[in-house]
Amino acid sequence: PEPPTACREKQYLINSQCCSLCQPGQKLVSDCTEFTETECLPCGESEFLDTWNRETHCHQHKYCDPNLGLRVQQKGTSETDTICTCEEGWHCTSEACESCVLHRSCSPGFGVKQIATGVSDTICEPCPVGFFSNVSSAFEKCHPWTSCETKDLVVQQAGTNKTDVVCGPQDRLRA
C-alpha cells in the first residue's frame, strides 16, 4: 500500500507511517513501527504535558516563588501546569503571573471603583460632585457628602472631592 502523506487526529507521520500521539500527561519514549504501538511514559512528579504530543521530555511545573510575592493558586497535575497568584495585597504584573507588585492606593479625591485581585490592580475613579475621599486607600470608595438637611442642619462649608461638607445649626430669627 502507498505510504500515507497525512494522518488522522491524534496521530503523527514518521518514517512514512502514522503513529499515535501520546496522551496528555505522557511523553514519547519510542515511535511506533508497523508492528508496535507508540511507546509513551507518564510524566514524573512536578512535570506535565497538557496536549496530545510527541514530546520526549515533559515540561516542569511553574515555581511560585514566594520571594517574588507568589503563591500556589492551583497545584499542577501531570496534565496541567501549576497556577500562581499573588499574596494578599499584591497582584500579577502579567498574564503569566511571573512576579507581583503591591496594589495601588487611590489618592484623596479618588475612590476605589474596583478592588484589586491577585491578577488585577486597583481601579480608581475621581469622586464626582456630591462625593469625596479624604484618604489614600486601596479599599475605600468615594463617600457621599453628609446631608445637612436630614439632620436639620445647614451647610456651613461646601464639600469638595477631598472633603465632606461642614454642617452647622440654622440661624433662627427672634420674634
Epitope: 518514517n15 515511535d31 511506533c32 513501527t33 508497523e34 508492528f35 508496535t36 504501538e37 511507546e39
Partner: antibody
Framework: EVQLLESGGGLVQPGGSLRLSCAAS????????MHWVRQAPGKGLEWVAV????????YYVDSVKGRFTISRDNSKNTLYLQMNSLRAEDTAVYYC??????????WGQGTLVTVSS | QSVLTQPPSASGTPGQRVTISCSGS????????VYWYQQLPGTAPKLLIY???QRPSGVPDRFSGSKSGTSASLAISGLRSEDEADYYC???????????FGGGTKLTVL
C-alpha cells in the same frame, strides 16, 4: 525488569512438530510486535517471523512459510511459534525478541531445537 | 547466503579503531534504517546501534554507526578485549517483506 523467556525446545524427528513459547514480563506486552529469530549451530542470525501487537499482521521468512505459525495470547503475555513438518535445517537456537523503533531491543536467552532421527 | 554482506572476520589490537562493513541493496539498506547487534560468546544478541547511528542507553560512545546509499558500517574505537564478539547488521527488506541479517563478523582483539 523487562524479560523474555523461551521454552519448548528439544529433540524432534524430521517431519515432526514442536511448539515454542516465549513468556514476557516487565512491560506492556500487548503494545509490542514480537519476532522469532534463529541461529543454527556455528552460524549467523536468521529472522524467522514477526507478529504485530494485536496479532493482525504476520510475516515469515520464505523458508518457513506454510510450515511455521506465529501467534500470541496477550492475556497470558505469551508469544508462540508452532513448527510443523520440521527439517534438519530447522535445527537452531530460537530466540524471541521485542519489536521497537529502536530495533529488536529485548531478546530472550534462546531455546534449542534439534531436528534429527 | 545472507542478503546483507559482511566480512566474516575482523581484528585489531587494544586501543585501535576497527570498522565493519555491511553491504545491501535498494530494497533494504537503500530504503530503510540499519541496525547493529553484538553477540558475545555463548549469549543472546544485544542491540548496539539503531536507526543507522543511534546508540541505546548503556552502549559506550566508542561504538558508532553510519550509512551511505546501500552500505552501512560499524566503527569501534579504543578497542577493548571485551569487544571480542560477533557483530551483525540488519534491515527491513521491502521486497521480501521481512527482516534480513548480515552473515555476521567475528571480531578478534589481538
Amino acid at each position: 525488569e523487562v524479560q523474555l523467556l523461551e521454552s519448548g525446545g528439544g529433540l524432534v524427528q524430521p517431519g515432526g512438530s514442536l511448539r515454542l513459547s516465549c513468556a514476557a514480563s516487565g512491560f506492556s506486552f500487548s503494545s509490542y510486535g514480537m519476532h522469532w529469530v534463529r541461529q543454527a549451530p556455528g552460524k549467523g542470525l536468521e529472522w524467522v517471523a514477526v507478529i504485530s501487537y494485536d496479532g493482525s499482521k504476520k510475516y515469515y521468512v520464505d523458508s518457513v512459510k506454510g510450515r511455521f505459525t506465529i501467534s500470541r495470547d496477550n492475556s497470558k503475555n505469551t508469544l508462540y511459534l508452532q513448527m510443523n513438518s520440521l527439517r534438519a535445517e530447522d535445527t537452531a537456537v530460537y530466540y524471541c525478541a521485542r519489536d521497537s523503533s529502536r530495533g529488536f531491543d529485548v531478546w530472550g536467552q534462546g531455546t534449542l531445537v534439534t531436528v534429527s532421527s | 547466503q545472507s542478503v546483507l554482506t559482511q566480512p566474516p572476520s575482523a581484528s585489531g589490537t587494544p586501543g585501535q579503531r576497527v570498522t565493519i562493513s555491511c553491504s545491501g541493496s535498494s530494497s533494504n539498506i537503500g530504503s530503510n534504517y540499519v541496525y547493529w547487534y553484538q553477540q558475545l560468546p555463548g549469549t543472546a544478541p544485544k542491540l548496539l546501534i539503531y536507526r543507522n547511528n543511534q546508540r541505546p542507553s548503556g552502549v559506550p560512545d566508542r561504538f558508532s554507526g553510519s550509512k551511505s546509499g546501500t552500505s552501512a558500517s560499524l566503527a569501534i574505537s579504543g578497542l577493548r578485549s571485551e569487544d571480542e564478539a560477533d557483530y551483525y547488521c540488519a534491515a527491513w527488506d521491502d521486497s521480501l517483506s521481512g527482516w534480513v541479517f548480515g552473515g555476521g563478523t567475528k571480531l578478534t582483539v589481538l
